[in-house]
Amino acid sequence: QPCPYPMAPPNGHLSPVQAKYILKDSFSIFCEPGYELLQGHLPLKSFAAVCQKDGSWDQPMPSCSIVDCGPPDDLPSGRVEYITGPEVTTYKAVIQYSCEETFYTMKVNDGKYVCEADGFWTSSKGERSPPVCEPVCGLSARTTGGRIYGGQKAKPGDFPWQVLILGGSTAAGALLYDNWVLTAAHAIYEQKHDASSLDIRLGALKRLSPHYTQAWAEAVFIHEGYTHDAGFDNDIALIKLNNKVVINSNITPICLPRKEAESFMRTDDIGTASGWGLTQRGLLARNLMYVDIPIVDHQKCTAAYEKPPYSGGSVTANMLCAGLESGGKDSCRGDAGGALVFLDNETQRWFVGGIVSWGSMNCGEAGQYGVYTKVINYIPWIKNIISNF
């Protein structure tokens, strides 16, 4: 006996169309673009029913339901706006992602996504994953291009990348992105296998103030070329934080140097170092201090550290020097790991050119200079660690 004549569901069509369907005859259902085969909530890629000997179809008719891409993924540090209509998530609906203004910028695409027939929110470039809100780097409240031994007091927002690292001795670091800290290898070497012991503080101005944002380390990455207690070559390290920090006017990452950055770091160009290290009084600073110091000719610096008690070859090509020939302005113990920053005149953003590493026994000594890890030499290393971990 023939099976009941099948009626295609709305927004679907049936094939093949026959005058009647008898034993072993079958039909398939195909949905219009933007509609999908469903049995209730369960999706089907294809549907075919077979006429059985008792005159019934072996399965019920599915529906062709409009594709629903569902609520779009949340965007950390951003928001999503429904363009087509409130909460509309069906085929051809449009949404617009945007990042929190001032402190975040959108990476990857323009943030416009459409609900496509395959059920995925898709950007104009064909990406299915949501965009990324990346922290804006190098913003500072400072208006001048002005260190710590012989320095001045910093004001809120002047050095929002400044990180205070406790857990061993007092050290410093600089925030990169929203979950990495750039610092000196020697400053955290003792904690390299005990990352969780590092007490990391952001957004602080006063060293002992309770007003700061607490962060904890997930992992420590010491440059493989660094040898502890055998000079300071490759004195660079990264700390991965176990959570992303919220970016604001007091907590903002420093930029990494662009390829063209060396044009802003020539001899006599001014860099700024900041920290809570020893001041002229011989005590750790209570308030975050900063000092503006010029870059020193590399040969001049090398020569300054070839005399005893320093050994020849102390200053390598992976280092840069800064300070006054007359002395009086320098970074000092407790500043280690902090950033020596420069203003990129083209982007008007601050970038890290050096990391406070080592210097003369007596900070601010005439004819001696502060020695900093030359960050531009380590951009591939930094990017490799950050992208892989």
Partner: antibody
Amino acid sequence: EVQLQESGPGLVKPSQTLSLTCTVSGYSITSDYAWNWIRQPPGKGLEWIGYISYSGRTSYNPSLKSRVTISRDTSKNQFSLKLSSVTAADTAVYYCAVLYALDYWGQGTTVTVSS
Amino acid sequence: DIQMTQSPSSLSASVGDRVTITCKASQNVDTNVAWYQQKPGKVPKALIYSASYRYSGVPSRFSGSGSGTDFTLTISSLQPEDVATYYCQQYNSNPLTFGQGTKLEIK
């Protein structure tokens, strides 16, 4: 014949992430249907966790959505479950299954959440 | 969420009896209901889908009916091997939900 087999650790510590994999043989997970995870606490009934469809789209139980991720590896014909921040209440037998026109279940794997 | 309420929660019947288990949905689920049988320590086995369609290999004594909110699983002549817990399940909407189960024993 279609076969599903769950694998993963039988013991997970509280607050950690439970990770299970379902290996499918005899049918490609991209060919059709929804590939589900279902669990059954000791002595209790069945609870649907979510599915990943043939196209890679996911649907999750709203009561677990904030903690659940279902993904797939089409090259290995596998789909996986990750359940974060587990507690003792997540102790159960976990099944992978394809439901509706095809109906096949894995044998189930017992996961205990305990320190 | 759609609640699926089964009754009775347990029942005892004799071999050869006609057994009926009912399932009530808290809202309309069309015919998107399946029935499962689970024997102690075993994996659930599907019996019925789309309220009344029997899976291949399932004995003809099992049948299902209903639509909307009221559904029934019938065993026309109870056999000793039918001792199990039976679950209804709706797959009409997210989340898929199961009834609490009906435990069937032989008198």
